[in-house]
């Protein structure tokens, strides 16, 4: 808190400019009125301030705004968005894009800070839902934002913003979130030729049901192992010999060198040892010849 | 780097004049902010005046109306003239350069913002 003193003769600030910075805090505090600087917020980032200075100026804005800062404000905050705390952003209802990049913008090349989550949380609530534009903009800074929020969070995501999403905006995206997301992608891209719409779901596939995969292996789509190896296991397993041939073309000669692990060692465990040595690979694990095999979650079904 | 170096200094009655210098070299574009302080003895360093990139000016309350600060860009260096002299205004006093470029400290009033200085220069003034 800054101690309440006179402002001296002649120091009292006609406009927010430069020579303030030389302004100890408490000039600040008595010799700035809160209104001029709140019209005047464009020209506060320009100046070089310390952050105890940016501590006073943020002081006087909430002695202002005590019930939130307009948009008009916000959106020229600038540094001083460094200063404010989660508490002060839930109090602000940020509607504009335009807001949101500028204050993006000052946090750049950080990690999301909890002022940053916090913003917008209250945007993406704003808006309803996660468009396209506010997609596009939150993967250009935050390529992990996609894989950050939870299905539920995901589930409000319109299809159309799917085409907002690069390849590595879903590296960190676990099954649960690919779940979410693959079926608004399969929509999204549903119009698209087989090698397009391949290129395009590819990313998503860790989301894909057997039979979308079953799809898939018509098409002569070449999935390199990479995509293959983030397949949901429980997709994988009913696939055949001769569809995982298929998916993977010319990439099927690196099942060898994942076969220890998931989903390929389960996928082996399923199939029939006759039928992997069709590959010409050396896989080995598979049901040997004469076993007869039990699909026990039939069984089970049936009781 | 930047080398700060400052001359004018000297002795002289109270009322008179005296204009400092201070020369920079070692760089092409104006530092944030140059400033002149003084340091009294036994006192702390006070900002004298203040001379931002852009050309603003400030002025301790001490020395309003009585200092002025100003720069000749081509000769990269800044002045501080020093009118109607008191005694209590002898103390060394010494020019720095700011870019602080991580916005640490108080305000540009404060000595630890401050990253580069001169030896300093005494002015005496006799009553």
């Known amino acids: 808190e800054v101690e309440k003193t006179a402002c001296p003769s002649g120091k009292k600030a006609p406009e927010i400019d430069e020579s303030l910075i030389f302004y100890k805090k408490w000039e600040l505090e008595a010799c700035v009125d809160a209104a001029l600087l709140a019209t005047q917020m464009d020209r506060v980032n320009a100046i070089p301030f310390t952050y105890e200075q940016l501590d006073v100026l943020k002081h006087k804005l909430d002695e202002l705004y005590p019930q939130g800062y307009p948009e008009s404000v916000i959106q020229h905050l600038g540094y001083l968005f460094l200063k404010m705390s989660p508490e002060d952003i839930r109090k602000w209802n940020v509607t504009s894009l335009e807001t949101l990049k500028a204050l993006l913008e000052v946090n750049k090349g950080h990690e999301m800070s909890p002022q940053v989550a916090t913003l917008i949380d209250r945007f993406v609530k704003g808006r309803g839902q996660l468009d396209k534009d506010t997609l596009d903009t939150l993967t250009a800074f935050y390529p992990g934002y996609l894989c950050s929020l939870s299905p539920e969070e995901l589930s409000s995501v319109p299809p159309s913003s799917i085409w907002a999403v690069r390849p590595q905006d879903l590296d960190t995206c676990d099954p649960r979130q690919l779940d979410v997301l693959y079926p608004k992608a399969r929509l999204a891209f549903q119009n698209m030729n087989g090698s397009e719409y391949f290129v395009k779901i590819q990313s998503f596939l860790g989301g894909a049901p057997t039979e979308d995969l079953k799809a898939l292996s018509q098409q002569n789509v070449s999935m390199d192992l990479a995509t293959f190896m983030k397949l949901r296991t429980d997709a994988v397993l009913p696939l055949t010999v001769a569809e995982v041939q298929k998916l993977l073309g010319p990439h099927v000669e690196g099942l060898k060198a994942e076969e220890r692990h998931r989903p390929v060692r389960d996928w082996i465990l399923r199939q029939r040892q006759d039928d992997l040595d069709t590959l010409g690979l050396g896989l080995q694990g598979g049901i040997p010849n004469g076993y007869l095999v039990l699909d026990l979650s039939m069984q089970e079904a049936l009781s | 780097e930047v080398q700060v170096v400052e001359s004018g200094g000297g002795l002289v009655q109270a009322g008179a004049s005296l204009r400092l210098s201070c020369a920079s070299s070692?760089?092409?574009?104006?530092?944030?902010?140059m400033a002149w302080f003084r340091q009294a003895p036994g006192k702390e360093r006070e900002l004298v005046a203040g001379?931002?990139?852009?050309?603003?000016?400030y002025y301790s309350d001490s020395v309003k109306g009585r200092f002025t600060i100003s720069r000749d860009n081509a000769k990269n260096t800044v002045y501080l003239q020093m009118d109607s002299l008191k005694f209590e205004d002898t103390a060394v006093y010494f020019c720095?350069?700011?870019?602080?470029?991580?916005?640490?400290?108080?305000?540009?009033?404060?000595?630890?913002?401050?990253?580069?200085w001169g030896q300093g220069t005494q002015v005496t003034v006799s009553s």
């Open positions: 070692g760089r092409t574009i104006s530092p944030i902010a």
């Open positions: 001379l931002t990139w852009t050309g603003r000016t």
């Open positions: 720095a350069a700011g870019d602080n470029p991580d916005r640490r400290g108080s305000s540009w009033s404060s000595s630890s913002v401050y990253e580069y």
